[in-house]
Interface confidence: medium
């Protein structure tokens, strides 16, 4: 969990397409567990940007205290700033809430760089631009933190949307979404459309801009184009999936597919980058370098330490390749691919030298904890977290940044054999795997 990359910023057999197309089981979309169609009240309820996280407005306590909360599918605690901090404009004041209940228990969450700690309690929580319900949820009141809150990010807490298995201090602490589903009639599903701006936003622009949508309890057709393709959730802890093949500009990386998922592959809105295991990262960078060799970039760029800049409006998108990740499909021996553009993996940076320049950070980085499909991937797609059916859906986002020549894509089916072999089985120990 790396600060600056993980938010808070913490920032072989693999199955070749055989040219064979499997028929869809049906031309109809499968029946969804949630309401379908229009969720007008929830559309555009997120703000922010990939580098500092996407947040939703929530209210906590009685009378309601409004806070902006980072949407994080890579953790499972609902935690909010509950004490003054130089980077917080406001914080949760438990003493002002008549419905706050103290659980008399502490929680400590360390990251590779930074940490937060706090006190556990419960209170009434609602989402103004969400379902019209109020739930009693567990809240970690953050009393102390280091390198957790981000200056200028405009959020004051974090909404961990993953499963109880990775909740802190242990899996007995029910995550917010579980509480929501148990206490209301909201279907056990949410979907995210994260909209990267494609250009850097200054502070006032972020506050005025739309960052995307979190649809709680359903799927909104207006947020995507084409079909939704689903990949199984391998295990309910993180949102773990299986990648079976990786291509750069259509060229297979030709690695044993286990490498792509070593030691896991997760979908994480709280991470900025596409993070890849060391071997995969090195192979991918080598391939991206080769594909974009008409221009040379320093090593520092590929390591995320240097920006690359062009005069405003002259970024040569065409020299950079598309990246395709093939995901295990719902049908045996069937996969589908999601394809992102350089507009997703070259992240515009606001702290540019001058407004005459467009500067970018390479938003693919190395990981020691498996593949993390962070905001740069999610910004290309509408992503459905169908917890009820233990699957994650991908469709091309209606707001993804592209150019007149190329667009992000979700395509399938492809025949891919022995996909189960692509999953890595993490040795079970008593050690927590979360301190990453």
């Amino acid at each position: 969990t790396q600060h600056g990359i993980r938010l808070p910023l913490r920032s072989g057999l693999g199955g070749a397409p055989l040219g064979l197309r499997l028929p869809r089981e049906t031309d109809e979309e499968p029946e969804e567990p949630g309401r379908r169609g229009s969720f007008v009240e929830m559309v555009d309820n997120l703000r922010g940007k990939s580098g500092q996280g996407y947040y939703v407005e929530m209210t906590v306590g009685s009378p309601p205290q409004t806070l902006n909360i980072l949407v994080d599918t890579g953790s499972s605690n609902f935690a909010v700033g509950a004490a003054p901090h130089p980077f917080l404009h406001r914080y949760y004041q438990r003493q002002l809430s008549s419905t706050y209940r103290d659980l008399r228990k502490g929680v400590y969450v360390p990251y590779t760089q930074g940490k937060w700690e706090g006190e556990l309690g419960t209170d009434l929580v609602s989402i103004p631009h969400g379902p019209n319900v109020t739930v009693r949820a567990n809240i970690a009141a953050i009393t102390e933190s280091d390198k957790f809150f981000i200056n200028g990010s405009n959020w004051e807490g974090i909404l961990g949307l993953a499963y109880a298995e990775i909740a802190r201090p242990d899996d007995s602490l029910e995550p917010f979404f579980d509480s929501l589903v148990k206490q209301t009639h909201v279907p056990n599903l949410f979907s995210l459309q994260l909209c990267g701006a494609g250009f850097p936003l200054n502070q006032s622009e972020v506050l005025a801009s739309v960052g995307g949508s979190m649809i709680i309890g359903g799927i909104d057709h207006s947020l995507y184009t084409g079909s939704l393709w689903y990949t199984p959730i391998r295990r309910e802890w993180y949102y773990e999936v299986i990648i079976v093949r990786v291509e750069i500009n259509g060229q297979d990386l030709k690695m044993d597919c286990k490498e792509y998922n070593y030691d896991k592959s997760i979908v994480d809105s709280g991470t900025t980058n596409l993070r890849l295991p060391k071997k995969v990262f090195e192979a991918a960078v080598k391939s991206i370098k080769a594909a974009s060799s008409t221009e040379k970039f320093p090593d520092g760029f590929w390591l995320g330490e240097q920006l690359v800049c062009w005069q405003a409006g002259t970024t040569p998108w065409n020299i950079f390749p598309v990246i395709s990740l093939y995901l295990m499909g719902e049908v045996t021996n069937q996969s589908f691919r999601i394809t992102i553009l350089p507009q997703q993996y070259l992240r515009p940076v606001e702290d540019v030298a001058t407004s005459q320049d467009d500067c970018y950070k390479f938003a693919i980085s190395q990981s020691s904890t498996g593949t993390v499909m962070g905001a740069v991937i999610m910004e290309g797609f509408y992503v459905v977290f169908d917890r009820a059916r233990k699957r994650i859906g991908f469709a091309v986002s209606a707001c993804h940044v592209h150019d007149e020549f190329r667009t992000a894509a979700v395509e399938g089916p492809f025949v891919t054999l022995d996909m189960e072999d692509c999953g890595y089985n993490i040795p079970q120990t008593d050690e927590s795997t979360l301190m990453t």
Epitope: K296, G300, C309, D357
Partner: antibody, heavy 126, light 107 residues
Framework: EVQLVESGGGLVQPGGSLRLSCAAS????????IHWVRQAPGKGLEWVAS????????SYADSVKGRFTISADTSKNTAYLQMNSLRAEDTAVYYC???????????????????WGQGTLVTVSS | DIQMTQSPSSLSASVGDRVTITCRAS??????VAWYQQKPGKAPKLLIW???WLYSGVPSRFSGSGSGTDFTLTISSLQPEDFATYYC?????????FGQGTKVEIK
């Protein structure tokens, strides 16, 4: 809008001291190099000193080494030039200029001093 | 220190003339050479960076070329507003050094 505003110039006696300030706005000060360049009356440009706030790296022209000190306060986005043991030949208009550091790689190469202040006059005379 | 020798030190030309100013470095500075224009009482303005790249907003009649030790600034068709002093500067090695300047005057 990018701006560099120098201040602190004036008349000083030989052997005296003066501190020039360069207040920056409209760009990322931390990842820029700030340079001081001077121009004696009727003469050409002479580079004096530079600092890169993010690395702390400083550099000086031989003519001022040991007498001038460049510094930066990133919280104020301001660079300073502390000038001690001033001599008559230090009389000049002093400009501050900024240059993107190598944190910014231009596919065409690295940029030069692209923004300059209006200058402040330093006169060393008895 | 690297010396930058600029020539000529001054020249007289008419509107519409093609003007060439050269700069020679005492050792190779790769392509890290900039050209500036300065008018009396004003701060210098960047024209060309990294030997040949036109700075944003600078008219296309200005161009730069060269690498290593020999560099050239060319004004393809001199305009009234181009009468000024021009300086080259190497920024490959510290201390950065300027040429002595070329004053372009009206003939």
């Amino acid at each position: 809008e990018v701006q560099l505003v120098e201040s602190g110039g004036g008349l000083v006696q030989p052997g005296g001291s003066l501190r020039l300030s360069c207040a920056a706005s409209g760009f990322n000060f931390y990842y820029s190099s700030i340079h001081w360049v001077r121009q004696a009356p009727g003469k050409g440009l002479e580079w004096v000193a530079s600092i890169s706030p993010y690395s702390g790296y400083t550099s000086y022209a031989d003519s001022v080494k040991g007498r001038f000190t460049i510094s930066a306060d990133t919280s104020k986005n301001t660079a300073y030039l502390q000038m001690n043991s001033l001599r008559a030949e230090d009389t000049a208009v002093y400009y501050c200029a900024r240059q993107p550091t190598h944190y910014y790689y231009y596919a065409k190469g690295y940029k030069a001093m692209d923004y300059w202040g209006q200058g402040t006059l330093v006169t060393v005379s008895s | 220190d690297i010396q930058m020798t600029q020539s000529p030190s001054s020249l007289s030309a008419s509107v519409g003339d093609r003007v060439t100013i050269t700069c020679r470095a005492s050792q190779s500075v790769s392509s890290a050479v900039a050209w500036y224009q300065q008018k009396p009482g004003k701060a210098p303005k960047l024209l060309i960076w990294y030997a040949s790249w036109l700075y944003s907003g600078v008219p296309s009649r200005f161009s730069g070329s060269g690498s290593g030790t020999d560099f050239t600034l060319t004004i393809s068709s001199l305009q009234p507003e181009d009468f000024a002093t021009y300086y080259c500067q190497q920024y490959s090695y510290s201390p950065f050094t300027f040429g002595q300047g070329t004053k372009v005057e009206i003939k």
